[in-house]
C-alpha cells in the first residue's frame, strides 16, 4: 500500500543535515562518520542492516588509518566481557564497553551505546575501504554475544526523541571510482528518524518485516524481463530473505540463482558470456560508452504488501546488477562484474538492490518501504521501478519456517 497516511511530526519532510552523509561504493560498503568518546574520536563506520553490533577497530591493523583508543576517552566504561564473532569466512573479536557516541551529520544528540572494541580480526577490515568499524542496524536477536546487548539504534531511540525509523539511499556511481574519487564522492544518505522526500520519486510501498532479527521480508514472485521464474515461492525465501546494506550482491538461494541465471542468459543470448562471468570471476568489457544495456533483462522481485492478498514489485536494471570494476589491463574499456551470486543462507537484497531504491526501515510499524531512488543509475529507455498493487494469494505460504534448535526442541 502506498504511503498516504497523514504527516507525523519528525517522521518526514526535509533532513538537510543528513543528506549526503554516506560515502563509499557498493563493492566495499557505505560508511557514515561517527564520533566516539570524550573528547570525540572521529571514525568512519560501515552502515550494515545485516548485523546488530556496533563494533570498531580498537587496535592497530594494517588496513586501518585510525582506531578507537579507549584509554583516551574519559567516558569509556569497560563491561569486562569479551565478544567473538565468527563468519563463514573470517571473524572479529573484542572487548565490550560503553561510551558516548554521536553522528556529526545525523540527529543532534549524543547517546551512551554499547561498543565492541575490536582487538583481533581476520578477513573483516577491507584494504582501502576507508571505514574503521561497523554499525549493525538490525535487531537485538542477532546481537553478539547474545540478545541482551542492546544495539545502537535501540539505545538511540530509548535515550532521545528520535523516531524509531531510519532510511537509506545508497547511490551506486555507475562507473568505477579510484581511491581519491571515493574520498571526494557522495555515496548517499542515511536519514535517522525520518524520511526525506527529495531522495525518491513516486510512491513508497511497504512490505511487512516478517520477524525482527534481520530485516526479514517475504518475496512472493520473481520475474526476469516480465517472465515469471515459476518456482514455488518458498524457494525464494529459503531459508530467509533479508535486506542487507552490508552485502554487495543480490544473493539468491542455489535453485533460484540457477533459474535466474538461465533466464538472464537466455534474455542476453545475442552475446556469449563466459561461464566465469556468471560466477563473478570474469569481467565482461565493452569499448568505453558502448555497454549494450538493452540486451540485459530487468529483474523484478514481488514483495508481500501490507494488505491481505496484495503485493508490489521492485524492478532493477542491469545498471544495478552489473557492477563497474576498474582494471588497468583493460582501462580503455568499461568492464563489469555480474553482481548476482549464489547463497546458502537465503536471499540477500544487498547494495545491488538497494542502489535502485530509497529504502525506509520503519521499525516503529514493523515494515520496510521502497521507492525509486532519485540517484539510481539508469538510461534513457528504462528506469528502476516500484509498482503495485498486484493480487497475490497465499503469500504467507511463501515464508520458510526455520526449524528450531533450542533445548525444548532437542528434548523431543
Amino acid at each position: 500500500e502506498t504511503d498516504e497516511e497523514p504527516e507525523e511530526p519528525g517522521r518526514r519532510g526535509s533532513f538537510v543535515e543528513m543528506v549526503d552523509n554516506l560515502r563509499g561504493k557498493s563493492g566495499q560498503g557505505y560508511y557514515v562518520e561517527m564520533t566516539v568518546g570524550s573528547p570525540p574520536q572521529t571514525l568512519n563506520i560501515l552502515v550494515d542492516t545485516g548485523s546488530s553490533n556496533f563494533a570498531v577497530g580498537a587496535a592497530p591493523h594494517p588496513f586501518l588509518h585510525r582506531y578507537y583508543q579507549r584509554q583516551l576517552s574519559s567516558t569509556y566504561r569497560d563491561l569486562r566481557k569479551g565478544v567473538y564473532v565468527p563468519y563463514t569466512q573470517g571473524k572479529w573479536e573484542g572487548e565490550l564497553g560503553t561510551d558516548l557516541v554521536s553522528i556529526p551529520h545525523g540527529p543532534n544528540v549524543t547517546v551512551r551505546a554499547n561498543i565492541a572494541a575490536i582487538t583481533e580480526s581476520d578477513k573483516f577490515f577491507i584494504n582501502g575501504s576507508n571505514w574503521e568499524g561497523i554499525l549493525g542496524l538490525a535487531y537485538a536477536e542477532i546481537a553478539r554475544p547474545d540478545d541482551s546487548l542492546e544495539p545502537f539504534f535501540d539505545s538511540l531511540v530509548k535515550q532521545t526523541h528520535v523516531p524509531n525509523l531510519f532510511s537509506l539511499q545508497l547511490c551506486g556511481a555507475g562507473f568505477p571510482l579510484n581511491q581519491s574519487e571515493v574520498l571526494a564522492s557522495v555515496g548517499g544518505s542515511m536519514i535517522i528518524g525520518g524520511i526525506d522526500h527529495s531522495l525518491y520519486t513516486g510512491s513508497l510501498w511497504y512490505t511487512p518485516i516478517r520477524r525482527e532479527w534481520y530485516y526479514e521480508v517475504i518475496i512472493v514472485r520473481v520475474e526476469i524481463n516480465g517472465q515469471d521464474l515459476k518456482m514455488d515461492c518458498k524457494e525464494y525465501n529459503y531459508d530467509k530473505s533479508i535486506v542487507d546494506s552490508g552485502t554487495t550482491n543480490l544473493r539468491l538461494p542455489k535453485k533460484v540463482f540457477e533459474a535466474a541465471v538461465k533466464s538472464i542468459k537466455a534474455a542476453s543470448s545475442t552475446e556469449k558470456f563466459p561461464d566465469g562471468f556468471w560466477l563473478g570471476e570474469q569481467l565482461v568489457c565493452w569499448q568505453a560508452g558502448t555497454t549494450p544495456w538493452n540486451i540485459f533483462p530487468v529483474i523484478s522481485l514481488y514483495l508481500m504488501g501490507e494488505v491481505t492478498n496484495q503485493s508490489f514489485r521492485i524492478t532493477i536494471l542491469p545498471q544495478q546488477y552489473l557492477r563497474p570494476v576498474e582494471d588497468v589491463a583493460t582501462s580503455q574499456d568499461d568492464c563489469y562484474k555480474f553482481a548476482i551470486s549464489q547463497s546458502s543462507t537465503g536471499t540477500v537484497m544487498g547494495a545491488v538492490i538497494m542502489e535502485g531504491f530509497y529504502v525506509v526501515f520503519d521499525r516503529a510499524r514493523k515494515r520496510i518501504g521502497f521507492a525509486v531512488s532519485a540517484c539510481h543509475v539508469h538510461d534513457e529507455f528504462r528506469t528502476a521501478a516500484v509498482e503495485g498493487p498486484f493480487v497475490t494469494l497465499d503469500m504467507e505460504d511463501c515464508g520458510y519456517n526455520i526449524p528450531q534448535t533450542d533445548e525444548s526442541t532437542l528434548m523431543t
Epitope: G27, E271, K272, D275, G280, L283, A329
Partner: antibody, heavy 116, light 107 residues
Framework: QVQLVQSGAEVKKPGASVKVSCKAS????????IHWVRQAPGQGLEWMGM????????KYNQKFKARATLTVDTSTSTVYMELSSLRSEDTAVYYC?????????WGQGTLVTVSS | DIQMTQSPSSLSASVGDRVTITCKAS??????VAWYQQKPGKAPKSLIY???HRYSGVPSRFSGSGSGTDFTLTISSLQPEDFATYYC?????????FGQGTKVEIK
C-alpha cells in the same frame, strides 16, 4: 602497478607436499580471483584451479582436485597453492595469475622440482 | 574439456614479416579467447582478450580475430623482441585450456 610476487624455488621428495605463495599488490585484492597454472619443462600451460579472495570459494580442474588446495590470507593479500603426494611428473613451474578478462597479470613463477 | 589446437607448432620468420598463428577450439567458445606471449624462463605476458582486444600497453602490431571455433593472432611486422612462444587460451568454460603453443623463431 599490479604485481604478483611468488615464493622461491622448491626441491621436494616424491610423496611430500609443497606450498607456494603468491603475494598480490597494486589493486583491490578481494575484487579479483587468483588462478594457478603450471608448466612442465618444455611443455605447455595447464590450468589447475582458482580461488575468490573475497570468500575463499574455490574451483579446481578435476585433474588436481584430490591433491591441490588453494587458500587465501586477506590480511597479507596472499594466496597459497599446496600440492600433496608429489610425484616426478609434478616437476614444473607453477604460476599464479589474476583474473579480469582472462589472465591479464601473472606471477614470475615458482620452480618445483620433485626428485628422490 | 575444450581442446585448443594451435598451428603451426613452430615457424621461422624474419624481422618485418607478417606472421599469422591460428587456434581452433573443439567447440564454440564465442569470443572468449586470449593470446599470450612467453619467452624462455619468463612468465606468460597477456596480449589479446575477447579474441580481438589488445590489453593496455600492447603494441598495435599485435591483432586478433575470430569467433566461435576459429581464431587468429597476427603480428603485422615482426620485431626482434617478438621471437617467443605464443599460446591461445579459451576462458569460455571450465577447465580453462590452452593451445600447445607456437614457437616463432628467427629465420
Amino acid at each position: 602497478q599490479v604485481q604478483l610476487v611468488q615464493s622461491g624455488a622448491e626441491v621436494k621428495k616424491p610423496g611430500a607436499s609443497v606450498k607456494v605463495s603468491c603475494k598480490a599488490s597494486g589493486y583491490t585484492f578481494t575484487n579479483f580471483w587468483i588462478h594457478w597454472v603450471r608448466q612442465a619443462p618444455g611443455q605447455g600451460l595447464e590450468w589447475m584451479g582458482m580461488i575468490d579472495p573475497s570468500d575463499s570459494y574455490t574451483k579446481y580442474n578435476q585433474k588436481f582436485k584430490a591433491r591441490a588446495t588453494l587458500t587465501v590470507d586477506t590480511s597479507t593479500s596472499t594466496v597459497y597453492m599446496e600440492l600433496s603426494s608429489l610425484r616426478s611428473e609434478d616437476t614444473a613451474v607453477y604460476y599464479c595469475a589474476r583474473s579480469g578478462v582472462a589472465f591479464p597479470y601473472w606471477g614470475q613463477g615458482t620452480l618445483v622440482t620433485v626428485s628422490s | 574439456d575444450i581442446q585448443m589446437t594451435q598451428s603451426p607448432s613452430s615457424l621461422s620468420a624474419s624481422v618485418g614479416d607478417r606472421v599469422t598463428i591460428t587456434c581452433k577450439a573443439s567447440q564454440d567458445v564465442g569470443r572468449n579467447v586470449a593470446w599470450y606471449q612467453q619467452k624462455p624462463g619468463k612468465a606468460p605476458k597477456s596480449l589479446i582478450y575477447s579474441a580481438s582486444h589488445r590489453y593496455s600497453g600492447v603494441p598495435s602490431r599485435f591483432s586478433g580475430s575470430g569467433s566461435g571455433t576459429d581464431f587468429t593472432l597476427t603480428i603485422s611486422s615482426l620485431q626482434p623482441e617478438d621471437f617467443a612462444t605464443y599460446y591461445c587460451q579459451q576462458y569460455n568454460s571450465y577447465p580453462y585450456t590452452f593451445g600447445q603453443g607456437t614457437k616463432v623463431e628467427i629465420k
